[in-house]
Interface confidence: medium
């Protein structure tokens, strides 16, 4: 069975690379930039013409244990009068991220990487109109 | 597997022998989902706060390609297709986890890294500061 490569680039394996069992990757769990902070404009989820709410999912067997998901509040967008305009659409903006999942039995633990799709916010778009013949 | 501290029989992480690296299955769950935002939707063009997508490629990282959004305008596009500077286009940022090859160029040895990406833009009412 061929082991899938992570990434698309072929690497010459330097002599200094640590030995890794087949089918596995070695993962250092000390995190680079662990304490960096998101510096978005204040309250954009409420000030947006396509406002959204946040919900937090918590799973202690996942890193990060908290994943925040956004949900658009409206189908339409908020106009200058503060009313919903259904001739426009609020749509979710999504981003993939990696999480590490832990599976444990007593003192024994295994780890699995997983891609998850996070909805980060919403934007207001002009709808695509399909004309029926 | 490796050891999780659970009671006096398990080691603690301040021991010099405590593993700071773990072996992880190479098969990433959901790895084949579409990662090209240009292909997955055209919101970046249809938005009232449109953005351009810039390809950031780094072979020492997984995923090697990440798309960064840059808002096209300071203002937002109004119903006439013009930029309205009474509103602001602002980026929506998200912290994501990626894998960084460590040591460099090693095919199957990684470290987790948090990076900040701009995913898209949204149109907001500006915060107006009144000068006394």
């Amino acid at each position: 069975r061929k082991i899938p490569k992570v990434g698309h680039t072929f690497f010459q394996k330097p002599e200094s690379c640590p030995p890794v069992p087949g089918g596995s990757m070695k993962l250092d769990i000390g995190i680079i930039n662990e304490n960096q902070r998101v510096s978005m404009s204040r309250n954009i989820e409420s000030r947006s013409t396509s406002p959204w709410n946040y919900t937090v999912t918590w799973d202690p067997n996942r890193y990060p244990s908290e994943v925040v998901q956004a949900q658009c509040r409206n189908l339409g967008c908020i106009n200058a009068q503060g009313k919903e305009d259904i001739s426009m659409n609020s749509v979710p903006i999504q981003q993939e991220t990696l999480v590490v999942r832990r599976k444990h039995q007593g003192c024994s633990v295994s780890f699995q990487l997983e891609k998850v799709l996070v909805t980060v916010g919403c934007t207001c778009v002009t709808p695509v109109i399909h004309h029926v013949q | 597997g490796i050891t999780i501290p659970r009671n006096p029989g398990c080691p603690n992480s301040e021991d010099k022998n405590f593993p700071r690296t773990v072996m992880v299955n190479l098969n990433i769950h959901n790895r084949n989902t579409n990662t090209n935002p240009k292909r997955s939707s055209d919101y970046y063009n249809r938005s009232t706060s449109p953005w351009n997508l810039h390809r950031n490629e780094d072979p020492e990282r997984y995923p090697s390609v990440i798309w960064e959004a840059k808002c096209r305008h300071l203002g937002c596009i109004n119903a006439d297709g013009n930029v309205d500077y009474h509103m602001n286009s602002v980026p929506i940022q998200q912290e994501i986890l990626v894998l960084r090859r460590e040591p460099p160029h090693c095919p199957n040895s990684f470290r987790l890294e948090k990076i900040l990406v701009s995913v898209g833009c949204t149109c907001v009412t500006p915060i107006v500061h009144h000068v006394a």
Partner: nanobody, 119 residues
Framework: EVQLVESGGGLVQPGGSLRLSCAAS????????MYWVRQAPGKGLEWVAE????????YYVDSVKGRFTISRDNAKNSLYLQMNSLRAEDTAVYYC????????????WGQGTLVTVSS
């Protein structure tokens, strides 16, 4: 030396209440998330609740939501778990665990306190 000492366990009837305490020492308590974890007889570990450093954010496993409350007193270096409307399935050894220095690891545990819910 880091120490976590749980207390407050015991035998209680279904529907009853208990308050578990965990006294922490040997580290800067206010700098860490803290957890309650339980292990039922013959079962694996179950993460019950987490509380962030300043106590402002708490998380609970679905099976205890609305019945258990995690809290902390940073001035007293203490962690608490108020358990109401107890059920037979809450019977377990309850451990207090110090937050993770490394992601996905609990680096210190207490010795545990046994909670038995039975009529």
């Amino acid at each position: 030396e880091v120490q976590l000492v749980e207390s407050g366990g015991g035998l209680v009837q279904p529907g009853g209440s208990l308050r578990l305490s965990c006294a922490a020492s040997g580290f800067t308590f206010s700098s860490y998330s803290m957890y309650w974890v339980r292990q039922a007889p013959g079962k694996g570990l179950e993460w019950v609740a987490e509380i962030k450093q300043d106590g402002s954010v708490q998380y609970y496993v679905d099976s205890v939501k609305g019945r258990f409350t995690i809290s902390r007193d940073n001035a007293k270096n203490s962690l608490y778990l108020q358990m109401n409307s107890l059920r037979a399935e809450d019977t377990a050894v309850y451990y207090c665990a110090k937050g993770e220095i490394l992601p996905l690891y609990f680096d210190y545990w207490g010795q545990g306190t046994l909670v038995t819910v039975s009529s």
